[in-house]
């Protein structure tokens, strides 16, 4: 079994709906700095045929562009294949569909391999509740506290949300 964290009870459909990005982490800081390729923010998610579809917001030229991405299911329940800035093995690390989701990606771009983690929540007012869980997952996979960026409202394209 790949990772001991299973997909949410009731299936991926429970992940559907609105989400808010709270924190990012990476061993390669350039990826999550402002204008970094993984400084992107979740808007919403849906699931179909075992695949995860996400609308993400990407800051560009002072605006935020909404882009749709699909993470395709694999033989492993918590692992997905995502083509974005290279190839990504995307893992659902910790999931509470009503509250928060922690994912991490092993990104391969040209000859470079990097680790990126992402914390998202349903309710922004509760974001502090889930940061310790994110820090714990990050530590476990080898990302340190100083490699975590906690996002502000200005960061996460709040103005671009419907």
């Amino acid at each position: 079994q790949e990772g001991n964290h299973e997909e949410p009870q009731g299936g991926l459909e429970e992940l559907s709906g609105r989400w808010h990005s709270v924190a990012l982490a990476s061993n390669k800081s350039d990826l999550i700095k402002p204008w970094g390729h993984f400084r992107v923010f979740i808007h919403s998610m849906s699931a179909k045929d075992g695949n995860l579809h996400g609308d993400i917001l990407i800051p560009q030229d002072g605006q935020c562009e909404k882009v749709s991405l699909t993470a395709f299911k694999t033989a492993t329940s918590n692992k997905f294949d995502l083509e974005y800035w290279g190839h990504n093995d995307l893992y659902l690390a910790e999931v509470d569909p009503k509250s928060y989701l922690i994912l991490y990606m092993i990104n391969q771009y040209n000859d470079d391999t990097s680790l990126v983690a992402h914390l998202m929540v349903r309710d922004l007012s509760r974001q502090q509740d889930f940061l310790p869980a994110f820090e714990s997952v990050c530590e476990d996979i080898g990302l340190h506290k100083d490699q975590i960026v906690v996002l502000s409202d200005d960061d996460r394209c709040q103005g671009s949300r419907d």
């Epitope: 079994q1 790949e2 990772g3 001991n4 964290h5 061993n27 893992y91 690390a93 991490y104 092993i106 391999t113 990097s114 680790l115 997952v137 530590e139 476990d140 996979i141 080898g142 990302l143």
Partner: nanobody, 122 residues
Framework: QVQLVESGGGLVQPGGSLRLSCAYS????????IGWFRQAPGKEREFVAA????????HYTESVQGRFTISRDNAKNTVYLQMNSLKPEDTAVYYC???????????????WGQGTQVTVSS
């Protein structure tokens, strides 16, 4: 002093199973992601699988996905690689290595064992 010692290799028929062990000691939590790599004759060393510090998170190369399982017992400072449905192309020297981050690249691993030979042949 950092040490990683592999064991459990041997000769096995195609379709058979082996369990490799990697006993580690002497390093801090910072280098406690453990990976398995392998090197077949005349080929470069390649990533096989890795496991996070707690054992909660794992990563495999595609060719072994579903056949190999990596696990760890932190109380015994040991990481295991259960290899099922072995194929002749799995023949290689298998190395365990310790690194700081769950990535499938050799250069991320600072400490290496001496290796154990796995031969899959009828």
């Amino acid at each position: 002093q950092v040490q990683l010692v592999e064991s459990g290799g041997g000769l096995v028929q195609p379709g058979g199973s082996l369990r490799l062990s990697c006993a580690y000691s002497g390093f801090t939590l910072d280098n406690n992601v453990i990976g398995w790599f392998r090197q077949a004759p005349g080929k470069e060393r390649e990533f096989v699988a890795a496991i996070s510090r707690s054992g909660a998170f794992t990563h495999y190369t595609e060719s072994v996905q579903g056949r190999f399982t990596i696990s760890r017992d932190n109380a015994k400072n040991t990481v295991y690689l259960q290899m099922n449905s072995l194929k002749p192309e799995d023949t290689a020297v298998y190395y365990c290595a310790a690194g700081a981050i769950l990535l499938p690249t050799e250069r991320r691993y600072d400490y290496w064992g001496q290796g154990t030979q796995v031969t899959v042949s009828s």
